[in-house]
Interface confidence: low
């Protein structure tokens, strides 16, 4: 496996001023290794694993406002260590496909 | 940057445990890219429950396959062609 | 060898659609994201989608959707883009690309078609 | 869209010479940069992905470097077959985006 620690660009959406921040943080990218079971056992547990957090913690960060919109915190998190694992569909949306971390709405993007 | 010269490729690769002396079981095994980071306000706002993680995920899984019976009459599959496509079988 | 071989040239009336084609040899045709990218002179390159030929999602720049059609064939290894409503402007050499990186569509092109020129007129 | 920027269209250099090309986003992109080359006859080719790592088969003259918004591309001793377009392209967001291209020919 190389699931690893990543630096990428995350941008925060300001909504309300149609805006975004970029930041730059850690996540986990890389490849786990899978297989397809030849036998399906229905009582047998099927695990595919892939590059997710295994701790993460929680980074808070002030978004500038505009005209009638104040300065807001913003809070995201942010991965401090990898591994290939179980996504945990309580906290994550496993996915094949998603917008990608620094999507964002609006056209105007704030370093 | 991840590389994927650490993991090998998804291929097909004998089943010790199925497979006997001149009839191979093969089955598909290897790596596939996935990452995860933050989920962006776009997506939360599509969810029902709102996830602060997005995963994306591929795994190494059979694009064809044949059924056949083995010793024990344990019926497999006979995977004949592998690719990275969805996982089924990633969460908890 | 990865080798992407692209259709031939085409000629072809405004309003009207093309699909060109790009065949794929040399790996495992499903296990890779394939790109169409549009190339104008004095415009550069632009990127217009992309499709996993291993669950045929796909992924298109706004810019073209409405435009561009990716599909693929895994029996015969060759992605497809259709080309609908032609005008002018869509004039151009259009390559497919593949991805560097199994299972992922991340990573730009590490691999080329030779192009194909669509040139539109009446 | 991220805006990828090559300010030199075209560049002159004599055969032996180092040559940098550069090329600048509208906003960070974290290194998700690759580098191309398209040849005369229209054939492109991958040179350098993820800002400095030399793909495959292509020879050591040429590297990468950069971080944040700014890139560049040297070749460090240019030969006949280097005169080529080349093209930068970022792979942090989509739509993936091109730079307009910087046309390298030989004084």
């Known amino acids: 496996n190389s699931c690893e620690l990543t630096n990428i660009t995350i941008a925060i959406e300001k909504e309300e001023c149609r805006f975004c921040i970029s930041i730059n943080t850690t996540w986990c990218a890389g490849y786990c290794y899978t297989r397809d079971l030849v036998y399906k056992d229905p009582a047998r547990p099927k695990i595919q694993k892939t590059c997710t957090f295994k701790e993460l913690v929680y980074e808070t960060v002030r978004v500038p406002g505009c005209a009638h919109h104040a300065d807001s915190l913003y809070t995201y998190p942010v991965a401090t260590q990898c591994h290939c694992g179980k996504c945990d569909s309580d906290s994550t949306d496993c996915t094949v496909r998603g917008l990608g971390p620094s999507y964002c709405s609006f056209g105007e993007m704030k370093e | 940057a991840p590389d994927v010269q650490d993991c090998p490729e998804c291929t097909l690769q004998e089943n010790p445990f199925f497979s006997q002396p001149g009839a191979p079981i093969l089955q598909c095994m290897g790596c596939c890219f996935s990452r995860a980071y933050p989920t962006p306000l776009r997506s939360k706002k599509t969810m029902l429950v709102q996830k602060n993680v997005t995963s994306e995920s591929t795994c190494c899984v059979a694009k064809s396959y044949n059924r056949v019976t083995v010793m024990g009459g344990f019926k497999v599959e006979n995977h004949t062609a592998c690719h990275c496509s969805t996982c089924y079988y990633h969460k908890s | 060898e990865v080798q992407l071989q692209q259709s031939g040239a085409e000629l072809v009336r405004p309003g009207t659609s093309v699909k060109i084609s790009c065949k794929a040899s040399g790996y495992t045709f499903t296990n890779y994201w394939l790109g169409w990218v549009k190339q104008r002179p004095g415009h550069g390159l632009e990127w217009i989608g992309d499709?996993?030929?291993?669950?045929?999602?796909?992924n298109y720049n706004e810019k073209f959707k409405g435009k561009a059609t990716l599909t693929a064939d895994t029996s015969s290894s060759t992605a497809y883009m259709q080309l609908s409503s032609l005008t002018s402007e869509d004039s151009a050499v259009y390559f497919c690309a593949r991805t560097p990186l199994y299972g992922s569509s991340y990573g730009g092109f590490a691999y080329w078609g030779q192009g194909t020129l669509v040139t539109v007129s009446a | 869209d991220i805006v990828m920027t090559q300010a030199t269209s075209s560049l002159s250099a004599s055969l032996g010479d180092r040559v940098t090309i550069s090329c600048s986003a509208s906003q960070g992109i974290s290194n998700y940069l690759n580098w191309y080359q398209q040849k005369p006859d229209g054939t492109v080719k991958l040179l350098i992905y993820?800002?400095?790592s030399l793909h495959s088969g292509v020879p050591s003259r040429f590297s990468g470097s950069g971080s944040g918004t700014d890139y560049s591309l040297t070749i460090s001793n240019l030969e006949p077959e280097d005169i080529a377009t080349y093209y930068c392209q970022q792979y942090s967001k989509l739509p993936w985006t091109f730079g307009g291209g910087t046309k390298l020919e030989i004084k």
């Open positions: 499709i996993y030929p291993g669950g045929g999602y796909t």
């Open positions: 993820y800002t400095s």
